[in-house]
Amino acid sequence: HNTTVFQGVAGQSLQVSCPYDSMKHWGRRKAWCRQLGEKGPCQRVVSTHNLWLLSFLRRWNGSTAITDDTLGGTLTITLRNLQPHDAGLYQCQSLHGSEADTLRKVLVEVLADPLDHRDAGDLWFPGESESFEDAHVEHSISRSLLEGEIPFPPTSHHHHHH
């Protein structure tokens, strides 16, 4: 799988999007999990509503929320009040029975300062010999959410390494 890098600023909110084929994954619940090491399972953080038809309802686990646009085919995860320890490798998953398909691998980076965001020209992308075959960067700065406010999607640059 390609890996997408999402960068956010400590104390602010970050929105992660995972697009998927809505027909292929019709009727399937989704999940957001964290890979805590090179080996071992992906640790579930939050999953969509138990009733697939209600997947559009936002579900929270602590400061992490998930919502699914099943018609448009976009799973959205919001990390509120981002902290350094939220950084890590995550997966968006499509669930079927006890199995899970990976929709997207996501690397979340938490920066100390908005000025630490690099310009597109400064970003580095891994080559084929690196840990991931390909990288796709969503370079985002989000603002803090007011209570009950729906976060706006991050401004992003899309980069592909071939």
Partner: antibody, heavy 121, light 107 residues
Framework: EVQLQESGPVLVKPGASVKMSCKAS????????MNWVKQSHGKSLEWIGV????????SYNQKFKGKATLTVDKSSSTAYMELNSLTSEDSAVYYC??????????????WGQGTLVTVSA | DIQMTQSPSSLSASLGERVSLTCRAS??????LSWLQQKPDGTIKRLIY???TLDSGVPKRFSGSRSGSDYSLTISSLESEDFADYYC?????????FGGGTKLEIK
């Protein structure tokens, strides 16, 4: 076995710059964050900043912004820290410390042996 | 910045004695705290992370605990190799900060 081998002690003149290295072995270099920490003589530790070797993204302690620059060379699994405009206040031992998997969510499990920097005319 | 107030700054104790060191966080750090040991040659080793999880290879006489904003490192029965400097580290938020250190000396 995880090892972080830091470069040797250096004596530099005030106003000069110094670039120290931390060569990592025993693990996949790009999978783990690398932190840098300062310890002035007889004092406690201060976190300087962190770099994600996979993307090159950095975060700095505001106190060291403009003083320290963190970089990596993935081909040699080496992290670097450059300190500029050196003064006697920069005389210290500097440590590299590996974080956890694409994060620092469990702190710094592995430490280098430290590089002594002495600033003197 | 989060201040980590470590006490005592120095401690004299005898072999076999039980000792406790404490770090108080000025803000909530939710257990994102580790304890480090620094030997006289400068070598630093992590003993405990996530407030109470013992690192592999660390003797069981070391333990970590939390009570509100107070975090403690306890050595149940001191051995000669335990005499060193100890630091707490919070990695909950930027900038990461260390306690002032405790010098543990032989009485």
């Amino acid at each position: 076995e995880v090892q972080l081998q830091e470069s040797g002690p250096v004596l530099v003149k005030p106003g000069a710059s110094v670039k120290m290295s931390c060569k990592a072995s025993g693990y996949t270099f790009t999978d783990y964050y690398m932190n840098w920490v300062k310890q002035s003589h007889g004092k406690s530790l201060e976190w300087i900043g962190v770099i994600n070797p996979y993307t090159g993204a950095t975060s700095y302690n505001q106190k060291f912004k403009g003083k320290a620059t963190l970089t990596v060379d993935k081909s040699s699994s080496t992290a670097y820290m450059e300190l500029n405009s050196l003064t006697s206040e920069d005389s210290a031992v500097y440590y590299c410390a590996r974080g956890t998997y694409y994060s620092n969510y469990e702190g710094f499990p592995y430490w280098g042996q430290g590089t002594l920097v002495t600033v003197s005319a | 910045d989060i201040q980590m107030t470590q006490s005592p700054s120095s401690l004299s104790a005898s072999l076999g004695e039980r000792v406790s060191l404490t770090c108080r966080a000025s803000q909530e750090i939710s257990g994102y705290l580790s304890w480090l040991q620094q030997k006289p040659d400068g070598t630093i080793k992590r003993l405990i992370y996530a407030a109470s999880t013992l690192d592999s290879g660390v003797p069981k006489r070391f333990s970590g605990s939390r009570s509100g904003s107070d975090y403690s490192l306890t050595i149940s029965s001191l051995e000669s190799e335990d005499f060193a400097d100890y630091y707490c580290l919070q990695y909950a938020s930027y900038p990461y900060t260390f306690g002032g250190g405790t010098k543990l000396e032989i009485k």
